[in-house]
């Protein structure tokens, strides 16, 4: 058996700095939560303790605070690179500043692959955006490989500003051939990472043959097994298990929003890539977890421009 640890965030919405418990501006630092400096501390702690770790984001890093207003996505690329994310799926809000506002600050600057299988570029945009986002990526993890296939809400044209040269296809229709392609490449452990909401996440788990795990976003769904650690009321257990049409138990996860929690899912695979077991919980990023001083110093450096902006 081979064990994989999936760390995941979604719908962070520009909460680079720590926030209050309700994800608004931090007032009393001793009771604040989240932020990339605290997230990094926890991620590094897990990376040090466990051998096969992936850090994934399920979209909507863009939009939500003055950080995005001022930096327009450059802050997302910079701090996601600093935390060494392994992959990200495109969310609807990544298109809020149009395609150019996605390409220049994020797609061209991210060191990690950015994914969506159901977004197809056409016309003059096709060559401009080619290779900057991908339908899937095969990631080496230790001596194994894991396929990550991305998806984005097909409602994005109504929610954001993707323009007329991007077509948002049905998620399930678009995902299946990409998963099939991964199978032909002998990739037998496949994660669907995307931003379409919990109902679609569950449908993908049920309908897309070959998907082993679904890591979602968009609906800010909080899942938890046991007594929840803060104010959020769980919509179900973590992971939420869906029985696929071909009889497999597929774990589905999401980690609320605003960087308040770090999703933590441990998956055990057999030698054929079947999920044997899955367990975990979102980790509340409260003040018991110190902010990493190096990342915090970087945040403070970037913060200067925001202070000038607000005055």
């Amino acid at each position: 058996a081979w064990e994989l640890t999936i760390l995941h965030t979604n719908d962070v919405h520009s909460r680079l700095e720590q926030t209050s418990e309700d994800s608004s501006k931090c007032v009393n630092a001793s009771r604040c939560m989240g932020g990339v400096a605290r997230l990094f501390t926890k991620v590094q702690q897990i990376r040090r303790a466990e051998p096969n770790v992936l850090l994934l984001d399920a979209g909507d890093q863009y939009q939500g605070t003055i950080w995005f207003t001022v930096y327009k996505g450059a802050e997302v690329a910079h701090f996601m690179n600093a935390l060494r994310y392994d992959a990200m799926a495109l969310g609807n809000h990544e298109f809020d500043n149009g395609v150019e506002g996605l390409i220049e600050p994020l797609l061209k600057e991210a060191k990690f692959p950015i994914l969506s299988a159901n977004i197809k570029a056409k016309g003059p945009l096709a060559s401009q955006i080619s290779g900057l986002y991908l339908p899937y990526k095969v990631l080496p993890v230790g001596d194994e490989v894991v396929g990550i296939v991305g998806y984005t809400s097909k409602e994005t044209p109504f929610l954001s500003n993707p323009g007329t040269n991007l077509v948002f296809e049905d998620e399930i229709t678009a995902l299946q051939p990409e998963v099939d392609k991964l199978k032909t490449l002998n990739v037998n452990k496949i994660i669907a990472l995307g931003h379409s909401g919990f109902e679609m996440d569950k449908l993908i788990a049920q309908k897309v043959r070959g998907v082993d795990v679904v890591v979602g976003g968009h609906s800010n769904t909080f899942l938890y097994t046991g007594n929840p650690p803060s104010k959020e009321v769980p919509a179900g257990k973590y992971p939420f298990i869906v029985t696929s049409d071909d009889g497999r138990k597929v774990p589905v996860v999401q980690a609320y929003a605003f960087g308040k929690y770090l999703g933590y899912l441990k998956i055990e695979f057999d030698e054929r890539g079947n999920v044997i077991s899955s367990h975990g919980n979102p980790i509340l990023l409260n003040s018991s977890i110190p902010e990493d001083p190096s990342i915090k110093a970087d945040i403070n450096k970037w913060r200067i421009k925001l202070d000038n902006y607000s005055t």
Epitope: R84, D86, F112, L139, P140, V141, G142, E144, D292, S294
Partner: antibody, heavy 122, light 107 residues
Framework: QVQLVESGGGVVQPGRSLRLSCAAS????????MHWVRQAPGKGLEWVAV????????YYADSVKGRFTISRDNSKNTLFLQMNSLRAEDTAVYYC???????????????WGQGTMVTVSS | DIQMTQSPSSLSASVGDRVTITCRAS??????LAWYQQKPEKAPKSLIY???SLQSGVPSRFSGSGSGTDFTLTISSLQPEDFATYYC?????????FGGGTKVEIK
């Protein structure tokens, strides 16, 4: 067990070329970024080059840029360093080293070969 | 390029001593720092990565700490087999760079 074995070192005249090889065994070679690191006699360690697991990126130290080329053959579990226009200051033990599997990011090294000596002298 | 400065360049110590080696980066490198041990005529050996994580098989008397620009390698109780040269290395960005080394000798 996990092992890296370098070969191809020797004595060569300035301006000439040499090709080093590093044979890997005991792990999934195609999953790891691979590096060359060198050490001049009596000196410290100097990083030379890296090639990503999928060959999509290569980075070099300024001191060798334009003269050295790192490559790999994943089907043969072998890493190469093609060294052209060799200079006296390239004289060193050359080690191949495996990256920790940081995928898209710079890396530390967890496994080292035993090294192969390259002497550039007229 | 990021410069890595190690100190001291050499030190003499006795078996059982607590030994501390420091490494300073010319700019912040978060916790992307590794330590290696090298004995004469041998290849380097990985000791610590991510500033404080012990490589598997490395004795627990070795420990690392630090973040940003200042880092420390500590050997809590020096053993005969620990007499060697120690190098730090940053892997925050390319080109990867090493410190100049610290030679630990027998007093």
């Amino acid at each position: 067990q996990v092992q890296l074995v370098e070969s191809g070192g020797g004595v060569v005249q300035p301006g000439r070329s040499l090709r080093l090889s590093c044979a890997a065994s005991g792990f999934t070679f195609s999953n790891y970024g691979m590096h060359w690191v060198r050490q001049a006699p009596g000196k410290g360690l100097e990083w030379v080059a890296v090639i990503w697991y999928d060959e999509s990126n290569k980075y070099y130290a300024d001191s060798v840029k334009g003269r050295f080329t790192i490559s790999r053959d994943n089907s043969k579990n072998t890493l190469f360093l093609q060294m052209n226009s060799l200079r006296a200051e390239d004289t060193a033990v050359y080690y191949c080293a495996r990256g920790y599997n940081s995928r898209w990011y710079p890396d530390a090294f967890d496994i080292w070969g035993q090294g192969t000596m390259v002497t550039v002298s007229s | 390029d990021i410069q890595m400065t190690q100190s001291p360049s050499s030190l003499s110590a006795s078996v059982g001593d607590r030994v501390t080696i420091t490494c300073r980066a010319s700019q912040g490198i978060s916790s992307w720092l590794a330590w290696y041990q090298q004995k004469p005529e041998k290849a380097p050996k990985s000791l610590i990565y991510a500033a404080s994580s012990l490589q598997s098989g490395v004795p627990s008397r070795f420990s690392g700490s630090g973040s940003g620009t200042d880092f420390t390698l500590t050997i809590s109780s020096l053993q005969p087999e620990d007499f060697a040269t120690y190098y730090c290395q940053q892997y925050n960005s390319y080109p990867l760079t090493f410190g100049g080394g610290t030679k630990v000798e027998i007093k």
